[in-house]
Interface confidence: low
């Protein structure tokens, strides 16, 4: 864990002229309206920033936009507003910028009333050039890449018309009518719903699912009666209507949807929802609503083929369709998620999984903190995470949790510490190890953000005053040092660093404001002279992840295997630098019944690792439906956990009999199902 | 709780000016714009402008222009309304609404329309010789 | 400016039943649109903003729909506290401005 506050804090090394040297203030000539920024392309230090301006601030009738680009990551911007022909961009629409290192951006233009169609601005340069094209249609979505090809491009007319483009958006095509929700799949295949009566709020639950994997040659129907469709990993999903009644049951295909399967989940009514939470190649975390307006449901995790589901977590905290939910994925340490509960007492509290929903539990309360009001007993509770609800709630909580694949175990995180979430000002906690331990790291609301995969934390004081002062810490947050970065304080908006936090650059974005005036304004300060030299062998220690008995032979043991990392030295002052890649050892582990989940028909009692068959199968043949065929299970109540790597030790019996026999309540069988060409 | 009371009704002559005072309690007053809005006898809403707490910048409807004069005072939370040369057809309820629609730290991404959320009770100005 | 247009101007429905105002944008507003009940001798009360979404606290009786120039409020079965006049507002450019408003009275 994080060692505590009493440990000595060394100060780097005449920080403030490194810092000042490496300060790099760029005004805009902008009032202010608003301002958004992208990053194009990975370490090409391109940024390119769009500042739009209409009302409330001055009465217009047309906004303005302005264009601008850096190459040195913030630290000098070029107007390059002209490249787009002054054009006003819509700012709902954003910057499209292309997968991977493709360097294509599509801006999207505001026309006037009576045009035919949208226009568009396209680079495939990393924006040093663009291109005006009109467009066929007006757009009412994002240009959306295929993720194959960054030439492919599919958007959704206002006229709910289905349009693709295969050489970058020069060129565009409608390749069906009557679309509600297009989304690329794998293999430059699209997948969308149809509507055949009024429109796609009249038809929900009338829809149709086609693909085409030939760009709108030819299509296939792969669903009827569909409410909507998601991916997720290699799965899709469908929730499907009934036949007889308004509830609606998930359907999965692995196939891009050649056979489907029924999801052994609940069905849910018109007031209630699904939602795939988290997913990739091998499980997914689904939600399922609870009946009547209760802002909770039930998480389940599913199986490796996305049917058989195992209940994960009751009461999660979920406010209605679209609404908020605190689910997150720790990216900094394998197999880790924490979430919201609420509780019989309507009280929200923090719950963490370090086994991929396996097992939920509270966090540890950080050593060096007081329980607050919200705690029955002083001497017992547990830190409750601020993540997407408490935002939406207008708490004082200016950020959601943090953590970053390469910075291994940091997760930082606004919190309080008692028996459930207060809504009074929280304050900033960290952990080191992935979450099962946490320090306080600063007092009251920061926003912060991790460069260098970990080699420095950077935060900034959230305040309604303006600030000029930002904090920096190189071992993890447990020293800080303050740095004024400008004698003019700036009223704050929002910390940038390059996605991936292997920069050394932050951005600090805000605005100046003086009589009926206001700039916006970027300082971006480069933490290279502060990691002076570049982090050797000695550098770095052995870490075992997961571990929490270093006595037991299975220490660190999850989803069937232990990984060492090489982690660098809180004391190490150095510079990770950008090609840094994470250095980890896995080791296979001895199976036991908690690398199996309980398979159809059973579940596990609270506090048990065994799986029980549950009484209401108990005696009656196990079948469900598969690939639209029945078939019976043989099973002694087990299933290897998705992604589990264990070899040896306990070995469950299982055997799946096809029984010939055609699914009745499988709404996607493949007979259902037609081709067309175009 | 959130809340926006005015000052009490005012009675001018033709000609003359008034101040309507507006004061905000129960938030942090520099998070939300400020729109006045008015409403004569038997008629709709009609919008005069908006103030940002923040610097105080202004932005008024065209009618109004060069007659209307918004402040704003951050020690007290207090916005101002000055309507001057006023005519009998100015006789009307002024409410002000907080208005998120720039809520000055919400960030630089445009966050789409969220309404006049709260508003005063409203201050009846009649203007009679 | 844009011009807010509201109808029908007065609509009589008896209570339980349901209620549909429509509101017409001179030119596209996107989203940036809400719906305000006021009773007599009352300020305005927030309902609906971003077109679809329900002020806090506002009944589930309330929704309102439509983009760009056509949005529609629904009351979907009228109680005797419904009874208000109701009015439209765009926020897209300045000046903000208002519709007529449509009276809602018992039948």
């Known amino acids: 864990s994080a060692p505590g506050e009493d440990e000595e804090c060394g100060r780097v090394r005449d920080f403030v002229a490194k810092l000042a040297n490496n300060t790099h203030q760029h005004v805009f000539d902008d009032l202010r309206g608003s301002v958004s920024l992208s990053w194009v392309g990975d370490s090409t230090g391109v940024i390119l920033v769009l500042t739009t301006f209409h009302v409330p601030l001055v009465i217009m009738t047309f906004g303005q936009s302005k264009l601008y680009r850096s190459e040195d990551y913030g630290k000098n911007f070029k107007d390059i507003t002209d490249l787009i022909n002054n054009t006003f961009i819509r700012t709902e629409f954003g910057m499209a910028i292309g997968p991977e290192n493709s360097g294509k951006v599509v801006l999207t233009a505001e026309v006037s009333g009576g045009s035919r169609g949208g226009r568009i601005f396209r680079s495939s340069d990393f924006a040093k050039n663009f291109v005006q094209t009109d467009l066929p249609f007006h757009p009412l979505t994002q240009m959306m890449y295929s993720p194959q090809n960054s030439d492919y491009l599919l958007a959704l007319s206002t006229e709910n018309g289905l349009w693709v483009s295969k050489n970058f958006g020069g060129k565009w095509e409608e390749i069906h009518k009557a679309v509600c929700l297009a989304k690329w799949g794998s293999d430059n295949t699209i997948f969308f719903t149809t509507y055949a009566n009024g429109s796609c709020k009249a038809d929900l639950g009338a829809l149709e699912l086609w693909r085409t994997s030939d760009l709108g040659k030819s299509f296939k129907t792969i669903g009827v009666k569909i409410y909507s469709f998601g991916l997720g990993g290699r799965f899709l999903f469908a929730s499907v209507m009934a036949d007889k009644d308004t509830t609606r049951r998930i359907h999965v295909s692995t196939d891009q949807g050649d056979t489907w399967s029924m999801a052994q989940l609940p069905s849910v009514g018109q007031e209630q929802f699904y939602s795939i939470l988290a997913a990739n190649d091998d499980m997914v975390f689904m939600h399922v609503d609870e009946p009547g307006d209760t802002g909770f449901g039930t998480i389940f995790t599913s199986d490796d083929r996305g049917i058989v589901y195992s209940k994960s977590l009751d009461r999660h905290l979920y406010t209605t369709t679209g609404g908020e939910t605190d689910f997150t994925n720790v990216t900094s340490l394998r197999g880790v998620y924490i979430t919201s509960v609420l509780s019989e007492d309507n009280s929200i509290q923090t719950m963490i999984t370090f086994d991929q929903g396996g097992r939920w539990t509270h966090l540890r309360k950080p050593e060096n903190s007081e329980c607050d009001a919200t705690a029955k007993n002083k001497n017992e509770c547990s830190l409750h995470i601020h993540a997407s609800y408490s935002i939406s709630q207008k708490l004082n909580v200016p950020m959601a949790p943090l953590s970053e694949p390469n910075a291994v175990g940091i997760v930082i995180a606004h919190g309080s510490v008692g028996d459930a979430i207060s809504v009074m000002v929280p304050d900033v906690y960290i952990s080191d190890d992935g979450g099962y331990s946490w320090t306080k790291m600063l007092e009251g609301p920061h926003y912060y953000t991790i460069l260098d995969s970990g080699g420095i934390i950077v935060a900034i004081e959230h305040s309604s005053r303006p600030i000029n002062v930002i904090k920096f810490s190189t071992d993890e947050g447990q020293c800080w040092q303050t740095y004024t970065f400008t004698r003019d304080p700036i009223y704050f908006t929002g910390l940038a660093s390059e996605p991936g936090a292997r920069s050394m650059n932050i951005s600090i974005w805000g605005f100046t404001e003086s009589f009926l005036t206001s700039q916006w304004v970027s300082y971006t300060i480069d933490f290279k002279d502060i990691l002076e030299r570049n982090c050797e062998e000695k550098d770095y220690t052995i870490w075992l992840a997961h571990s929490t008995d270093p006595e037991d032979y299975e220490d660190g043991c999850i989803l069937g295997y232990k990984e060492q990392f090489l982690r660098l030295r809180k004391s190490s002052v150095c510079q990770n630098g950008r090609d840094y890649v994470v250095t980890k050892q896995p080791s296979i582990c001895l199976c036991s019944l908690e690398d199996f989940l309980c398979d159809f028909g059973y579940y596990r009692p609270e506090n048990d690792s065994k799986c029980v068959e549950q009484p209401e199968l108990k005696g009656h043949d196990l079948e469900f439906c598969l690939y639209g065929r029945e078939e019976h299970l043989t099973t002694n109540g087990y299933r290897k956990i998705p992604g589990d790597k264990c070899q040896g030790g306990v070995n469950p019996v299982r055997e799946v009999k096809d029984l010939k026999k055609k699914c009745t309540s499988n709404f996607l069988s493949p007979e259902k199902q037609n081709s067309k060409s175009n | 709780q959130v809340q926006l009371v005015q000052s009490g009704a005012e009675v001018k002559k033709p000609g003359a000016s008034v101040k309507v005072s507006c004061k905000a309690s129960?938030?942090?007053?520099?998070?939300?714009?400020m729109s006045w809005v008015r409403q004569a006898p038997g008629q709709g809403l009609e919008w005069m402008g908006i103030?940002?707490?923040?610097?105080?910048?202004?932005s008024y409807a065209q009618k109004f222009q060069g007659r209307v004069t918004m402040t704003r005072d951050t020690s007290t939370s207090t916005v101002y309304m000055e309507l001057s040369s006023l005519r009998s057809e100015d006789t009307a309820v002024y409410y002000c609404?907080?208005?998120?629609?720039?809520?000055?730290?919400?960030?630089?991404?445009?966050?789409?329309?969220?309404?006049?959320?709260?508003w005063g009770q409203g201050t009846t100005v009649t203007v009679s010789s | 400016e844009i011009v807010m247009t509201q109808s029908p101007a007065t609509l009589s429905v008896s209570p339980g039943e349901r209620a549909t105002l429509s509101c017409r944008a001179s030119?596209?507003?996107?989203?940036?649109l809400a719906w305000y009940q006021q009773k007599p001798g009352q300020a305005p009360r927030l309902l609906i903003y971003?077109?679809?979404t329900r002020a806090t606290g506002i009944p589930a009786r309330f929704s309102g729909s439509g983009s760009g120039t056509e949005f529609t409020l629904t009351i979907s079965s009228l109680q005797s506290e419904d009874f208000a006049v109701y009015y439209c507002?765009?926020?897209?450019?300045?000046?903000?401005?208002f519709g007529g408003g449509t009276k809602v009275e018992i039948k």
């Open positions: 103030i940002n707490p923040i610097g105080g910048s202004t």
């Open positions: 971003g077109a679809s």
């Open positions: 030119q596209s507003v996107s989203s940036n």
């Open positions: 609404a907080r208005d998120p629609s720039g809520i000055a730290l919400a960030g630089p991404a445009s966050r789409g329309y969220y309404g006049m959320d709260v």
């Open positions: 507002q765009q926020a897209r450019l300045g000046p903000w401005t």
């Open positions: 129960g938030y942090t007053f520099t998070k939300y714009y």
